[in-house]
């Protein structure tokens, strides 16, 4: 059985002021069982944008449904994006740890770029 | 507060059909998953079926190609259709809500199902 | 029969310490949890993906892991433990979800 993968297809995307992202990322495996967060930056300091255990995220929607038992998309949508959301995204895979989680497989990133509305 | 009322159990001869239902209420009941659980009399539990919030399904292998599990998330109601029902089938029903990896978290009181002639 | 395996019954003192074990699953696919089953009663989720405790259940009972078996260990039994407690799972090979079946405990 080959190792998971977390696939992120989208080097860049470009998305206006006000307009929703879409950031694509998808898993070769169902296992090791685990849940997908979703941060914007790399390192210590990285930010969590979505959590597929817990929390609430007001402006992210999945683009499929998670519930599904054999769901491999993990994709997103951000919606009413700013020049705040500007950066770059990583989908990444936690395999189940005791007492936390641990950081097991991460996408190449999907750099988000907005395009300011016209004045 | 979450909430989950099994109805629709009762007394079927074998072969027959029943509908059970679940009313769900104090959650938002369109994004969680649900199972079916039952037990029989003096027995362990035995999951019967899953559903998805879109509506993928899942069964155990006891019930597959007699059971179908479906739902109304505008009614916030879960459905167990039972047919082809045999003695075996006898079982105290119970539907649960499902965590984000398909455990369980709620659970409702339960309705007894008797297949008898 | 149970794809899980647990011992059939633990009998403990009350203020003792009860550790009921479960095994049969893949440590790679599978998530555990505990569930209480007092008689004529619905079960009740005491610990869910191996090791988490709900909010409304009290901090005696915990659950830990340790390669492909799983422990529920209740600190300082009380008579109101007494119940049947199951280990359930997810397993995400087969998309099923199995149980094992069952521990009956007695609070001496």
């Known amino acids: 059985e080959e190792e998971l993968q977390v696939i992120q297809p989208d080097k860049s995307v470009l998305v206006a002021a006000g307009e929703t992202a879409t950031l694509r990322c998808t898993a070769t495996s169902l296992i090791p069982v685990g849940p997908i967060q979703w941060f914007r930056g790399a390192g210590p300091g990285r930010e969590l944008i979505y959590n597929q255990k817990e929390g609430h995220f007001p402006r992210v929607t999945t683009v499929s449904d998670l519930t599904k038992r054999n769901n491999m998309d993990f994709s997103i949508r951000i919606g009413n994006i700013t020049p705040a959301d500007a950066g770059t995204y990583y989908c990444v895979k936690f395999r189940k740890g005791s007492p936390d989680d641990v950081e097991f497989k991460s996408g190449a990133g999907t750099e988000l770029s907005v395009r300011a509305k016209p004045s | 507060e979450v909430q989950l009322v099994e109805s629709g159990g009762g007394v079927v001869q074998p072969g027959g059909s029943l509908r059970l239902s679940c009313a769900a209420s104090?959650?938002?009941?369109?994004?969680?998953?649900m199972s079916w659980v039952r037990q029989a009399p003096g027995k362990g539990l035995e999951w019967v079926a899953g559903i998805s919030s879109g509506s993928d399904t899942y069964y155990g292998d006891s019930v597959k190609g007699r059971f179908t599990i479906s739902r109304d998330n505008s009614k916030n109601t879960l459905y167990l259709q039972m047919n082809s029902l045999t003695a075996e089938d006898t079982a105290v029903y119970y539907c649960?809500?499902?965590?984000?990896?398909?455990?369980?978290?709620?659970w409702g009181q339960g309705t007894l199902v008797t297949v008898s002639s | 029969s149970y794809e899980l395996t647990q011992p059939p019954s633990v009998s403990v003192s009350p203020g003792q310490t009860a550790r009921i074990t479960c095994s049969g699953g893949?440590?790679?696919?599978?998530?555990y949890a505990w569930y209480q089953q007092k008689p004529g009663q619905a079960p009740v989720t005491l610990i869910y993906s191996d090791d988490k405790r709900p909010s409304n259940i009290p901090e005696r009972f915990s659950g830990s892991s340790s390669g492909t078996t799983v422990t529920l260990t209740i600190s300082g039994v009380q008579a109101e433990d007494e119940a049947d407690y199951y280990c359930?799972?997810?397993?995400?090979?087969?998309?099923?979800?199995?149980f094992g079946g069952g521990t009956k405990l007695t609070v001496l």
């Open positions: 104090g959650f938002t009941f369109s994004s969680n998953a």
């Open positions: 893949s440590y790679s696919s599978y998530y």
């Open positions: 649960a809500r499902e965590t984000w990896n398909h455990l369980f978290d709620y």
């Open positions: 359930g799972g997810y397993d995400q090979s087969s998309y099923t979800n199995p």
